[in-house]
Amino acid sequence: QWQVFGPDKPVQALVGEDAAFSCFLSPKTNAEAMEVRFFRGQFSSVVHLYRDGKDQPFMQMPQYQGRTKLVKDSIAEGRISLRLENITVLDAGLYGCRISSQSYYQKAIWELQVSALGSVPLISITGYVDRDIQLLCQSSGWFPRPTAKWKGPQGQDLSTDSRTNRDMHGLFDVEISLTVQENAGSISCSMRHAHLSREVESRVQIGDTFFEPISWHLATK
């Protein structure tokens, strides 16, 4: 009997990209007359269904309608590919394909890992009290949540407060704050993506006299 094989490692996609999932029968077997079901998590959550020699779009979950195409150019050899367009973070998770003849079925399961690389961090000054400078570093559009860090002149980690929230698309916005003294030197804020091993960084130089003292004079007529 044939077996079904799917992607042998997690499929990677960035938000906004298209993804392709492939399933094939081994040994090669014509699957034109079989049911091919791509599903999400559980068998009944249909991403795309091919049955009776044609696609069955009315069986799809609403969030996949208009976003999938079953590539059947090699279905006679038992090879089927599903394209999923315009990936969002909500698409991340386990997927499977189940191929069934009248008397037999097999399935394969794999993971879709979705990532989004956020913006270059923006460092701003939020306060200046008793020669202490309050810094804020903001970056948006990440998935999953990045590791956010302040680093000192020698690259040492600096303790920090961080806040995270999610936007309407499920992406993470991160901000971290830090209080430093006027002569702190070179301070950097970095955001690191866990899966992609990518890091974005911004740097600011805090000099000895960051703000010059100003003498105020009252102008009188």
Epitope: A20, F21, S22
Partner: antibody
Framework: EVQLQQSGAELVRPGASIKLSCTAS????????MHWVRQRPVQGLEWIGR????????NFAPKFQDKATITADTSSNTAYLQLSSLASEDTAVYYC????????????????WGQGTSVTVSS | QIVLTQSPAIMSASPGEKVTITCSAR?????MQWIQQKPGTSPKLWIY???NLASGVPDRFSGSGSGTSYSLTISRMEAEDAATYYC?????????FGGGTKLEIK
């Protein structure tokens, strides 16, 4: 065997329109996406757009949005590219290509190309 | 749209020499394709999904990369490898191609 047979060379006047054809054999075009790519003389490849012949949905590169129309006829297994308001800078070889399913690495790619149609726009 | 920049634009290599062509994307993509074209002929798929060789491509070719940086490498240059190579991203619309690298034999 998969083949893409394109229509013959065209010599047209500025301002005219033409319709190029790409007839597939060895597979059904509705099972794939069909793309059009152009190559101006001594230049690189430029993606024009693609169609999903199963439903007629098409995407275009922004610069070709008002220049190109892509259609498909699944009964004749043929994809078409219509170009309007032709100018000398549209002189190029136009290729059709199939984006087929490739089964290693979980991706797909433009795996078969037509022989190209040469379009010359000249007065 | 995702702009792809190839380097070098033109290069020549001696038979047996190792050759590397790079493709830099202005923003990250998950996969890259490479296409070979010889003068007067249609383009051919050469490498897909970053590192998979298309049917009939000699195993002296390899592809690698991730994110914004991708490359095509020939371990030992041969005369038949002289051609123009284009990188192409299939991750987003509009699909885009690099400007091409013309590889000549010395």
């Amino acid at each position: 065997e998969v083949q893409l047979q394109q229509s013959g060379a065209e010599l047209v006047r500025p301002g005219a329109s033409i319709k190029l054809s790409c007839t597939a054999s060895g597979f059904n075009i509705e099972d794939d996406y069909m793309h059009w790519v152009r190559q101006r003389p001594v230049q690189g490849l430029e993606w024009i757009g693609r169609i999903d012949p199963a439903n007629g949905n098409a995407n275009f590169a922004p610069k070709f949005q008002d220049k190109a129309t892509i259609t498909a006829d699944t009964s004749s297994n043929t994809a078409y590219l219509q170009l309007s308001s032709l100018a000398s800078e549209d002189t190029a070889v136009y290729y059709c290509t199939r984006e087929g399913g490739l089964y290693y690495g979980n991706s797909d790619a433009m795996d078969y190309w037509g022989q190209g149609t040469s379009v010359t726009v000249s007065s | 749209q995702i702009v792809l920049t190839q380097s070098p634009a033109i290069m020549s290599a001696s038979p047996g020499e190792k050759v590397t062509i790079t493709c830099s994307a202005r923003s990250s993509v998950s996969y890259m394709q490479w296409i070979q074209q010889k003068p007067g002929t249609s383009p051919k798929l050469w490498i897909y999904s970053t590192s998979n060789l298309a049917s009939g491509v000699p195993d002296r070719f390899s592809g690698s990369g991730s994110g914004t940086s991708y490359s095509l490498t020939i371990s030992r240059m041969e005369a038949e490898d002289a051609a123009t190579y284009y990188c192409q991203q299939r991750s987003r619309y509009p699909r885009t191609f690099g400007g091409g690298t013309k590889l000549e034999i010395k």
